[in-house]
């Protein structure tokens, strides 16, 4: 196993009072291989609301590196390949579960955390506010 | 919370041989409360590649309810509000982490699982295959 400088405040695995704590098998099962293999690997470039991926790193989180989508333009790409500012590129956000070492540096104790990530962009008709 | 009949074969939380097991605090911390509240709540209708949301429920999984996006059209909505089949509506897919009760019905024992979900749709230029 890994040698980690152990935090002396790490909770005891047998502690009955550790709040809402469960045993989790970390042998992550992947249910995806037999699903639709048409993954969105190149959509970020082919979309009318294209996006770039930006790196966000936090070593106490798993996954530690999260690549977030940032829309390339305020508008959307039209049929001529130009940006049309009458439409808006907006991020599609998804709430995901990540694991955080808690207390920090404890190798056997984690907390589930929900974070919001942008996974891609879509082109939407803008909401126009008419001033009376 | 939900009352689940306990499986008599549930592993002992103290079992040192329970495979690759750690303690996880399920008192989920939500880091999203201070983020931009302009979530993509109405993008599914306003997008040029609109989608419907379908409920997927599994009581043996956490989160037990996952909303999946299904693109409404093969093509994309053009400026006239009609479907343009020269463009394609495609799902943006994302793997997420969920917890699955393992063995089933055990309240304190889970396995991490990756599942693929469709989060929304985006409009892309199709890949045209030219036949020689």
């Amino acid at each position: 196993g890994i040698t980690i400088p152990r935090n002396p405040g790490c909770p005891n695995s047998e502690d009955k009072n550790f709040p809402r704590t469960v045993m989790v098998n970390l042998n992550i099962h992947n249910r995806n291989t037999n699903t639709n293999p048409k993954r969105s690997s190149d959509y970020y470039n082919r979309s009318t609301s294209p996006w770039n991926l930006h790196r966000n790193e936090d070593p106490e989180r798993y996954p530690s590196v999260i690549w977030e989508a940032k829309c390339r333009h305020l508008g959307c790409i039209n049929a001529d390949g130009n940006v049309d500012y009458h439409m808006n590129s907006v991020p599609i956000q998804q709430e995901i579960l990540v694991l955080r070492r808690e207390p920090p540096h404890c190798p056997n104790s984690f907390r589930l955390e929900k974070i919001l990530v942008s996974v891609g962009c879509t082109c939407v008709t803008p909401i126009v506010h008419h001033v009376a | 919370g939900i009352t689940i009949p306990r499986n008599p074969g549930c592993p002992n939380s103290e079992d040192k041989n329970f495979p690759r097991t750690v303690m996880v605090n399920l008192n989920i911390h939500n880091r999203n409360t201070n983020t931009n509240p302009k979530r993509s709540s109405d993008y599914y209708n306003r997008s040029t590649s609109p989608w419907n949301l379908h409920r997927n429920e599994d009581p043996e999984r956490y989160p037990s309810v996952i909303w999946e996006a299904k693109c409404r059209h093969l093509g994309c909505i053009n400026a006239d509000g009609n479907v343009d089949y020269h463009m394609n509506s495609v799902p943006i897919q994302q793997e997420i982490l969920v917890l699955r009760r393992e063995p089933p019905h055990c309240p304190n024992s889970f396995r991490l699982e990756k599942i693929l979900v469709s989060v929304g749709c985006t409009c892309v230029t199709p890949i045209v295959h030219h036949v020689a």
């Epitope: 196993g1 530690s64 | 793997e95």
Partner: antibody, heavy 126, light 107 residues
Amino acid sequence: EVQLVQSGAEVKKPGESLKISCKASGGSFISYGISWVRQAPGQGLEWMGGITHFFGSTDYAQKFQGRVTITADESTTTAYMELSGLTSDDTAVYYCAREPNEFWNGYYTTHDFDSWGQGTTVTVSS
Amino acid sequence: EIVLTQSPDFQSVTPKEKVTITCRASQAIGSELHWYQQKPDQSPKLLIKYASYSVSGVPSRFSGSGSGTDFTLTINGLEAEDAGTYYCHQSASLPYTFGQGTKVDIK
């Protein structure tokens, strides 16, 4: 850019044990995994096992189960691969490779090998 | 375990020619397939990840395609420096496995 530097060549006798190190620099050591891959002379690549640093959890190929132990020391950002009960069939170049474990482009964690050590030549001979 | 079978085992090619290497998986692996290049006496180097995604620093003549069980690595306009052995690798399920390799020689 992550760099992996492995320990030097080894000559071993049958029945002995081997321990190779892989020192990582650049990037956050805790965030990725290290796999060990070997290549016998004139042969292809063979995955032996790996460690996910964040959890300290290991996976081994069935063929090496019970004979291989992969460990890591977070304080020195070094991974180790120990192989016991050596035979002449274990003569090979041993590589460590980084597994990024990154949330990227639709994947929750990525499992390609994006950085490799220079290799450690191991000769087992009586 | 998932078996990856590459073809051909060996290819002798003239510079500027197009090279196509295929990799077939014994069961569906989605897009969890990666391609590596190994030059003589060097470590392998990642070329393409997740079937079709180009890795930064890798020349644009290298491209990948496929999903499910059938995958292709294409070198559009081979250069002398591309001589070496090419391996596919699946990360869909443990144990990770590699193809047997395809050796590309320059005529």
